[in-house]
């Protein structure tokens, strides 16, 4: 059956609506026209739309779609952005406290090792922070550097305090001896394992959250195709050309159109689901040595234990190092 | 044994945080985030439906627009694309995702792979064989995890983890998001270009 004639044979209602979209009336016909030049709202009879109006409707339809998409993702976007910021800051605070705990341990138990120990501890935790934020640093290197740097100070200040401060040559020998003689036992390796596991997990957790933001931002700012624009225009605006201002699109029709427009976006679904489930699995495993909070805040204690281990074996070590580094020590006393 | 007197806190504001018993730890905050994220697990598959429900669609009206004509809401014509001869929806779907979408899918695949490899194997949280040689006497037990915090009575208990810090206690409840009152849907007031 032919559509009912426009209730207003003068296109007055259409004009007053269109004026809100586009001030200036020159695009709206005074009275219904054949509309043979229309490409989207193909008329079955006289129409109150012109080609220019149709273009404006298409533009508006695509804009509406973008706004709807942004509104749809707002809650999710806020959730991830806020949490990414919170966790990043929380991790930095944990690192800061871990550094403070470790410095305090040195100050209380080994005051003669400060301020050198403070410097090494500070550098170590700087690398921890940088690693979490994605820097290409090797955890084993930073743990090795910590113990390599600490041992000469421990030896010259705690175990053999008679050596002069200027004993630079013996430092070279002591650094080498640290690993050769395993002076800290298995503690460096233990710390490497705990720190690398907990930091790796922390780093990937932050990376995953930041990628989540990127995913939402990408789909949030999609530009819809011309074909989609036409479909949306026909669904939302073509009825106006017939003067049907109060009519709304059918629900099923809307779903079909949206699925067409969002076919590409919906392809993300499978990987998005997997992303959330994989992230859940990761989070479920973030405890004990996979929990940086637990590992880093306990590090001062493990370092303390490692120094106690050196002290426990001091007699044996001093004799061995005395022989091993004899040449260096003699040079110092000349 | 090592001890940690509180007067040595370099960052004083932490003092009031470290002993708050009822604040969340980071791990509980992580789990809370996952629970909230899981409510968005169908976000992308549900998008078309979400957008339809938040844009003008005939709900209580008898008649609705099918792209070409006015039809009864429950008729077969209501779900059909009124101008199916003009644009092929199947063709639109066959075009495949935009390059930016393909790129983001690749990134998601990559992070998913990383997350899977990083996920802790079930049943065992740690590697038993830390080193070929066993610990010497006086070292930790063979479970490397036991090495955390074993230095005597005065030791700060690591189990009492850093509480989720006061300065970070943003309220993450989404109800408080500015402009995110779920009752005020775009259908009602957000998209000014719809005039019904």
């Amino acid at each position: 059956q032919p559509p009912p004639p426009p209730p207003d044979a003068t296109c007055h209602q259409v004009r007053s609506f269109f004026q809100r979209l586009q001030p200036g009336l020159k695009w709206v016909p005074e009275t219904p026209v054949p509309g043979s030049d229309l490409q989207v709202c193909l008329p079955k009879g006289p129409t109150c739309c012109s080609r220019k109006m149709e273009e404006k409707y298409q533009l508006t339809a695509r804009l509406n779609m973008e706004q709807l998409l942004q509104s749809a993702s707002m809650e999710l976007k806020f959730l991830i952005i806020q949490n990414a910021a919170v966790f990043q800051e929380a991790f930095e605070i944990v690192v800061r406290h871990a550094k403070n705990y470790t410095n305090a341990m040195f100050k209380n138990n080994y005051p003669s090792l400060t301020p050198q120990a403070f410097e090494f501890v500070g550098e170590f935790f700087t690398d921890v922070s940088l690693y979490i934020l994605g820097s290409d640093i090797n955890v084993d290197d930073m743990v090795n550097e910590l113990f390599d740097s600490l041992f000469p100070v421990i030896y010259t200040q705690l175990m053999n305090p008679g050596l002069p401060d200027s004993a630079l040559d013996i430092n070279e020998c002591l650094r080498g001896a640290r690993r050769d003689l395993k002076v800290f036992g298995n503690f460096p390796k233990l710390i490497m394992t705990q720190v690398s596991k907990s930091l790796q997990v922390t780093r990937i957790f932050l990376q995953a959250l930041n990628l989540g933001i990127e995913v939402i931002n990408t789909t949030d700012h999609l530009k819809f195709s011309k074909d989609c624009g036409r479909m949306l225009t026909r669904m939302w605006y073509c009825s106006y050309c017939q003067g049907l201002m109060m009519v709304k699109p059918c629900g099923g029709y809307c779903n079909v159109v949206m699925q067409g427009c969002m076919a590409g976006v919906v392809e993300i679904d499978k990987y998005w689901r997997e992303y959330i489930l994989s992230l859940e699995e990761l989070v479920n495993g973030m405890y004990r040595i996979y929990d940086m909070e637990n590992v880093l805040l306990g590090l001062f204690s493990t370092i303390h234990d490692s120094i106690q281990y050196v002290q426990k074996n001091a007699g044996k070590l001093t004799t061995t190092i005395g022989k091993l580094c004899a040449h260096s020590q003699q040079r110092q006393y000349r | 044994s090592a001890y940690y007197p509180e007067d040595l806190f370099i960052d004083k504001k932490v003092l009031k945080v470290a002993h708050v018993e009822h604040e969340e730890t980071l791990s509980s905050r992580r789990r809370e985030l996952i629970q909230k994220l899981k409510s968005f697990i169908s976000f992308y598959s549900a998008l078309p439906g979400y957008i339809c429900s938040h844009s003008p669609v005939a709900e209580n009206d008898t008649l609705c627009w099918n792209g070409q004509e006015l039809v009864e809401r429950y008729s077969q014509k209501a779900a059909r694309n009124g101008m199916k001869n003009q644009f092929n929806l199947h063709e639109l779907k066959m075009k495949g995702p935009e390059p930016v979408v393909s790129q983001i899918i690749d990134k998601l695949k990559h992070i998913n792979q990383l997350l899977r490899t990083m996920s802790v194997p079930k049943g065992r949280v740690l590697d038993k064989n830390l080193d070929e040689e066993g610990f010497e006497s006086g070292d930790c037990g063979d479970d490397e995890d036991e090495c955390i915090g074993g230095s005597g009575d005065g030791m700060m208990k690591v189990k009492n983890q850093l509480r989720f810090l006061a300065e970070l206690a943003y309220d993450l409840d989404v109800d408080d998001v500015p402009g995110n009152n779920q009752q005020a849907t775009p259908k009602d007031n957000e998209i000014s270009t719809f005039h019904n």
Epitope: S129, M142, N144 | -
Partner: antibody, heavy 120, light 112 residues
Framework: QVQLKQSGPGLVQPSQSLSITCTVS????????VHWVRQSPGKGLEWLGV???????DYNAVLISRLSIKKDDSKSQVFFKMNSPQVDDSAIYYC??????????????WGQGTSVTVSS | DVVMTQTPLSLPVSLGDQASISCRSS???????????LHWYLQRSGQSPNLLIY???NRFSGVPDRFSGGGSGTDFTLKISRVEAEDLGIYFC?????????FGGGTKLEIK
């Protein structure tokens, strides 16, 4: 005392690779990193890369595809290799020991330098 | 990359004079950890560079106390209180706050 001695050819053709060996004494490669730097009249001093005590390496991003640094701890030797050298790679190449903390360190002892001319 | 600019290019002095060399970086060398990784080297004629000062103001082992370093952020200075003959050569500043490490173009200290 700490010493770094360099050896390598002075003249290299673009088709060959540029290889220099740095032999160290007075310290162990298992506890110190070794950097490579070059100096040319046109570019001044330019940091090329480093090999750490663990064997891990860091390179200058501009040259990463052409550089390789390896070492033999037991022989106290570090090996620097640059593939497809060009004329503007002609320079004096230095190895130097890392002092300070890893990549935030400095070179506290330097080799004597190897003058390299790339010419066809 | 961080660009290090040294002034002057050449500094003619008489022995016993004070000398001052300036080094400016294109971005701040203050690391997020509070340290500044700015170092000074001296290269005598026909020799390899030698470390003089590390982290702005710390003299390396064996370096005489007539050498002092100062500055912060992007502006740094090396001072020699009384120039001696062995101090002649080219002075380089270098930074390791940012990767890659970069060096200044050098300042040649020579006799007037």
């Amino acid at each position: 005392q700490v010493q770094l001695k360099q050896s390598g050819p002075g003249l290299v053709q673009p088709s060959q690779s540029l290889s220099i060996t740095c032999t160290v004494s007075g310290f162990s490669l298992t506890s110190y990193g070794v950097h490579w730097v070059r100096q040319s009249p046109g570019k001044g001093l330019e940091w090329l890369g480093v090999i750490w005590s663990s064997g891990n390496t860091d390179y200058n991003a501009v040259l990463i595809s052409r550089l390789s640094i390896k070492k033999d701890d037991s022989k106290s030797q570090v090996f620097f290799k640059m593939n497809s050298p060009q004329v503007d790679d002609s320079a004096i190449y230095y190895c130097g020991r890392n002092g300070g903390w890893l990549l935030r360190g400095f070179m506290d002892f330097w080799g004597q330098g190897t003058s390299v001319t790339v010419s066809s | 990359d961080v660009v290090m600019t040294q002034t002057p290019l050449s500094l003619p002095v008489s022995l016993g004079d004070q000398a001052s060399i300036s080094c400016r970086s294109s971005q701040s060398l203050l690391h997020s950890n509070g340290n500044t990784y700015l170092h000074w080297y001296l290269q005598r004629s026909g020799q390899s560079p030698n470390l003089l000062i590390y982290k702005v103001s710390n003299r390396f082992s064996g370096v005489p106390d007539r050498f002092s370093g100062g500055g912060s952020g992007t502006d740094f200075t090396l001072k020699i209180s009384r120039v001696e003959a062995e101090d002649l050569g080219i002075y380089f500043c270098s930074q390791s706050t940012h990767v890659p490490w970069t060096f200044g173009g050098g300042t040649k200290l020579e006799i007037k």
